[in-house]
Amino acid sequence: APTSSSTKKTQLQLEHLLLDLQMILNGINNYKNPKLTRMLTFKFYMPKKATELRHLQCLEEELKPLEEVLNLAQSKSFHLRDTKDLISNINVIVLELKGSETTLMCEYADETATIVEFLNRWITFCQSIISTLT
């Protein structure tokens, strides 16, 4: 059974992940982002089901295309901290949260999503899990 300290750690990690995803979304939605139109043409795959931490496997598998879009976006008016580091940090958190005991084959929905829809989906996921922990 999860201890209060492990629950707290999970909560903090989820909050960190949530902040990273929100930071990316805010940067993309910035009206000064000159590459927004181009960024919105990228296809992202959405999980059929995302209700448990193990479903973060589906986010992990989409981090490479996410990095690619963010590299495209970098400009004077849209600047995230080093994209590689940001994606790497997200990856570390995701790996810790989902655990490595069971390897999940991620099931994706038939429809694709834009980067904005993709980020909103995972932001909602984080918020939902955090609310169950508190």
């Epitope: 990228f42 295309p65 038939d110 429809e111 694709t112």
Partner: antibody, heavy 122, light 107 residues
Framework: EVQLVQSGAEVKKPGESLKISCKGS????????IGWVRQMPGKGLEWMGI????????RYSPSFQGQVTLSADKSISTAYLRWSSLKASDTAMYYC???????????????WGQGTTVTVSS | DIQMTQSPSSLSASVGDRVTITCQAS??????LNWYQQKPGKAPKLLIY???NLETGVPSRFSGSGSETDFTFTISSLQPEDIATYYC?????????FGPGTKVDIK
């Protein structure tokens, strides 16, 4: 090896229908946009449209919108170009090509099929 | 649609010559430009992407430069196997239009 293999040459009569194919191998077919390009005899290259095999999302050039239909069957890694009623002016070489970056169509085409010759004559 | 123009439409040069082809876009396309080589009876082959990046496996005698509306493609030392038609293509806006092509042959 990343490859696109197209179906063989076709000779058809005006008014007939036709579907030519483009089969991808050596890469994740669903993750890259596939474009189609027409080359009429002795002429240059004309961009027709693109399809994303994962969800069959399509974009057409206004010049070809309503003239042809793009489709894909991701289970067999194959994209298709279809005409419901051919005209003599459809006589050309047709190429399929993969968009280099994957996930977005805003990249050039890096891998090309060998082309399919379509001849329409009465 | 963005119109692409190329010049010259054809050229003849000697082996070892430096060959230059220009491509002009009807509006700003940033660096979203490819150069393709098409040999007679063959499919086009990508040589240069993003205006100046050499595709893997393409000889270094081929190069590209330019941005916005004016682009240049160069063969530093023409070889017999370079006989082909060269096309530029923009991918800034749909539809992704091609230039009319430049036919290169040997004197």
């Amino acid at each position: 090896e990343v490859q696109l293999v197209q179906s063989g040459a076709e000779v058809k009569k005006p008014g007939e229908s036709l579907k030519i194919s483009c089969k991808g191998s050596g890469y994740s077919f669903t993750d890259y946009w596939i474009g189609w390009v027409r080359q009429m005899p002795g002429k240059g290259l004309e961009w027709m449209g693109i399809i994303y095999p994962y969800d069959s999302d399509t974009r057409y050039s206004p010049s070809f919108q309503g003239q042809v239909t793009l489709s894909a069957d991701k289970s067999i890694s194959t994209a298709y170009l279809r005409w419901s009623s051919l005209k003599a002016s459809d006589t050309a070489m047709y190429y399929c090509a993969r968009h280099r970056g994957g996930r977005s169509y805003y990249y050039g085409m890096d891998v090309w099929g060998q082309g399919t010759t379509v001849t329409v004559s009465s | 649609d963005i119109q692409m123009t190329q010049s010259p439409s054809s050229l003849s040069a000697s082996v070892g010559d430096r060959v230059t082809i220009t491509c002009q876009a009807s509006q700003d396309i940033s660096n979203y430009l490819n150069w393709y080589q098409q040999k007679p009876g063959k499919a086009p082959k990508l040589l240069i992407y993003d205006a100046s990046n050499l595709e893997t496996g393409v000889p270094s005698r081929f190069s590209g430069s330019g941005s916005e509306t004016d682009f240049t493609f160069t063969i530093s030392s023409l070889q017999p196997e370079d006989i082909a038609t060269y096309y530029c293509q923009q991918y800034e806006n749909l539809p992704f239009t091609f230039g009319p092509g430049t036919k290169v042959d040997i004197k």
